[in-house]
């Protein structure tokens, strides 16, 4: 065609897939009458008539564009709807009079790809691989034109590097004409890459300019041999008997090797393998002083059968031995003196304390407790506590009972008990002394006796309330080799109608179930009167 070499560059129209392209015929009035124009599409240098304009009226030609073309802007602009990637071609308008001129438009089509989908090698990468391994793939679906991919490691772009980094990209054309890009990152990784963050970036163009989309960041499982093995003990710090102690073997390799933990036997000077759980952890629960010793860990690479040994670790399970008190069962006369001595062994320095059992009052700080001018009240329990101040909770105790020789000593001298006639009454009487007293009652009934402690006894009596009993009351007598003593229980009939809640003559009614005919299940629990009682 004469003069084709001087053809001006076509006008560029850029549009996104799915939108409408406005193709404006740029012929000047001198070049042609816009009321009489033919529109062509050019594909592979073949032009096809797609639209005619006659007297300002448009008419589509049959074919692929038939349903998508319309005239706008008083016939100067051809609108192409629902643009697809296949529409990326040259369109030209040709005026008919006064002489045939044409105006060319290059339509460029764009579509942003979907978010890149990154997949990591699910099996991981060994650092000793002979060739670069597939680290991850990046897929950008449905973009146009083909987006560019850039791989990043720790925020820095990765470049091709012979025998180290290789990026393999390929694309497929979907039936829609859009491209799906797949990029495979192959690399030889090193141990330091175990924490590296990889991601891919898709760079693409739209009519509005250049854009990019990033994938999520991923880490890649990296496998590397163990170089170092060590032991860790939990809890950290001073250990004591009774603690739950975990001895854990650790290694700097991935995957972790197979572990075994052994303890040195001081007598044989040989290491004995300990039984660990499935995770290779030795659990001592409860820890005992016998667990103290020298531990070490052996790690095995099951592929190479090479083993590594940890530095040995000394484990000390602190303890306090059984506490011994002498004399173990002291007996003393009133007015005499007593020295109590406490002994124990420990892996640490010990502190001793003497406490009164009944009150928890601290009597002495130290292993020796001296008691002078002993009174009857001094009888009872004394507790020695041996503790390690530097290890909270590490202590042992021993209780010793001091017996003071003396005649029986009554818990009360006399007591009033509210009763109803014909009820079965449950009476109790308590006495202490050394030697331990026995208790007898002055009325018939069912009596039972129980030791409260070596010097104290409690007797209970079940008896039917009769008029005679109401008159005489009940006596209990405690006796031992050194004498006897008596307590009196006065029985008073209760009058439910006259007994008021604010009565200050008594502490109230004993709980009882009164039944004139049935003695079973009829009990009464007496309460002490509020006035002070004489003892002894």
């Amino acid at each position: 065609v004469p003069g084709e070499a001087e053809q001006p560059a076509p006008e560029l129209v850029e549009v996104e897939v799915g939108s409408t392209a406005l193709l404006k015929c740029g012929l000047s009035q001198s070049q042609g009458n816009l009321s009489h124009v033919d529109w062509f599409s050019v594909h592979k240098e073949k032009r096809t008539l797609i639209f005619r304009v006659r007297q300002g009226q448009g008419q589509s030609e049959p074919g692929e564009y038939e349903q998508r073309l319309s005239l706008q802007d008083r016939g100067a602009t051809l609108a192409l709807t629902q643009v697809t990637p296949q529409d990326e071609r040259i369109f030209l308008c040709q005026g008919k009079r006064p002489r045939s001129q044409e105006y060319r438009i290059q339509l460029r089509v764009y579509k942003a790809p979907e978010e890149p989908n990154i997949q990591v090698n699910p099996l991981g990468i060994p650092v000793n691989s002979k060739e670069p391994e597939e680290v991850a793939t990046c897929v950008g679906r449905n973009g146009y034109p083909i987006p560019q991919v850039i791989w990043y490691k720790n925020g820095r772009p990765l470049k091709e590097e012979k025998n180290r980094v290789h990026i393999q990209s390929s694309q497929t054309v979907e039936s829609s004409g859009l491209y799906t890009l797949q990029s495979i990152l192959k690399a030889q990784l090193v141990k330091e890459d175990k924490d590296a963050q990889f991601y891919c970036e898709l760079n693409y163009r739209l009519p509005s300019g250049n854009h990019m989309k990033e994938s999520r960041e991923v880490t890649v499982p990296v496998f590397y041999p163990t170089e170092k093995v060590w032991l860790e003990v939990e809890p950290v710090g001073m250990l004591k008997e009774g603690d739950r102690v975990e001895i854990r073997c650790l290694a700097d390799g991935n995957p972790p090797p197979h572990f075994s933990i052994s303890k040195g036997n001081p007598s044989t000077r040989e290491a004995e393998e300990e039984t660990t759980n499935d995770n290779g952890v030795l659990v001592l629960e409860p820890a005992r002083k016998e667990h103290s010793g020298r531990y070490e860990c052996q790690a095995w690479n099951l592929d190479t059968m090479i083993s590594l040994l940890s530095e040995p670790q000394e484990l000390l399970v602190n303890y306090v031995s059984d506490v011994r008190v002498s004399p173990a069962a002291p007996e003393r006369q009133e007015g005499s003196s007593l020295t109590l001595t406490c002994e124990a062994e420990s892996s640490q320095d010990l502190e001793f304390q003497w406490l009164r059992e009944e009150t928890d009052q601290v009597l002495e700080r130290g292993p020796v407790l001296q008691l002078h001018d002993l009174k009857r009240e001094a009888g009872g329990g004394y507790r020695c506590v041996a503790s390690v101040p530097s290890i909270p909770g590490l202590n042992r105790t021993q209780l010793v009972k001091l017996a003071i020789f003396g005649p029986p000593w009554m818990a009360f001298k006399e007591r009033k008990v509210w009763v109803k006639e014909n009820m079965v009454l449950n009476l109790s009487c308590e006495a202490s002394g050394h030697p331990r007293p026995t208790i007898s009652w002055n009325v018939n009934g069912t009596a039972s006796e129980g030791d409260q402690d070596p010097q104290r006894v409690l007797s209970t009596l079940n008896v039917l309330v009769t008029p005679e009993l109401l008159e005489t009351g009940v006596e209990c007598t405690a006796s031992n080799d050194l004498g006897k003593n008596t307590s009196i229980l006065f029985l008073e009939l209760v009058n439910l109608t006259t007994l008021t809640p604010d009565s200050n003559t008594t502490t109230g009614l004993s709980t009882s179930t009164a039944s004139p005919h049935t003695r079973a299940n009829s009990t009464s629990t007496e309460r002490k009167l509020p006035e002070p009682e004489s003892r002894g």
Epitope: Q119, L123, S129, E133, E134
Partner: antibody, heavy 116, light 106 residues
Framework: QVTLKESGPVLVKPTETLTLTCTVS????????VSWVRQPPGKALEWIAA???????YYNSAFKSRLTISRDTSKSQVVLTMTNMDPVDTATYYC??????????WGQGTLVTVSS | DIQMTQSPSSLSASVGDRVTINCKGS??????LAWFQQKPGKVPKLLIY???SLQTGIPSRFSGSGSGTDFTLTISSLQPEDVATYYC????????FGGGTKVEIK
């Protein structure tokens, strides 16, 4: 086109060692990894072992001590050996191609029966 | 290890029905999921990869969706030739398969 074909004994005695070979065509073992997958009769699929395009080997930890996977790139073959076979190892054994991380092509499978 | 749980274990539907099979991962596997079809006595055949990408040559009535832990395989219009057992498989960390879903025609 891409094909994978398993071969090996159909009957193995308990405690014996099984050796299976996967011969591939239509692709190179240096371009794609290969996995072994098995399926006991009437049961689900179970991944056993893999060898990557770079030659790295991977094993299912449930069998690790019994397995060895290797390849001969010149013969386009991947070999799996499984020691100490037991009747519970009776299954159809498949080899499958990685693309690059999922399995896009499978062999036709070989049924291995473990019985005395 | 990541466990994959398929439901239902079996189903029966009529020709033309829309069928959905579910697969749940014991942890987040993003989109590292494939679906396979295994006809009786045949080899597993890849249908879907990367959770929603249709393998070349597979009819468009098959589609996959989901991400993270919950995934679905949908057969938009069940055909007689779709009678098979369907397996999901994760490839996020190692390889594990679901227990399978047997699809039959009513």
């Amino acid at each position: 086109q891409v094909t994978l074909k398993e071969s090996g004994p159909v009957l193995v005695k308990p405690t014996e060692t099984l050796t299976l070979t996967c011969t591939v065509s239509g692709f190179s073992l240096t371009s794609n990894g290969v996995s072994w997958v098995r399926q006991p009769p009437g049961k689900a699929l179970e991944w056993i072992a893999a060898i990557s395009s770079g030659g790295s080997t991977y094993y299912n930890s449930a069998f690790k001590s019994r397995l060895t996977i290797s390849r001969d790139t010149s013969k386009s073959q991947v070999v799996l050996t499984m020691t100490n076979m037991d009747p519970v190892d009776t299954a159809t054994y498949y080899c499958a191609r990685h693309r690059p991380f999922y399995f896009d092509y499978w062999g036709q499978g070989t049924l291995v029966t473990v019985s005395s | 290890d990541i466990q994959m749980t398929q439901s239902p274990s079996s189903l029966s539907a009529s020709v033309g029905d829309r069928v959905t099979i579910n697969c749940k991962g014991s942890q987040n596997i993003y989109k590292s999921l494939a679906w396979f079809q295994q006809k009786p006595g045949k080899v597993p055949k890849l249908l879907i990869y990367d959770a929603n990408s249709l393998q070349t040559g597979i009819p468009s009535r098959f589609s996959g969706s989901g991400s993270g832990t919950d995934f679905t395989l949908t057969i938009s219009s069940l055909q007689p030739e779709d009678v098979a057992t369907y397996y999901c498989q994760q490839y996020y960390s190692g390889y594990t398969f679901g227990g399978g879903t047997k699809v039959e025609i009513k």
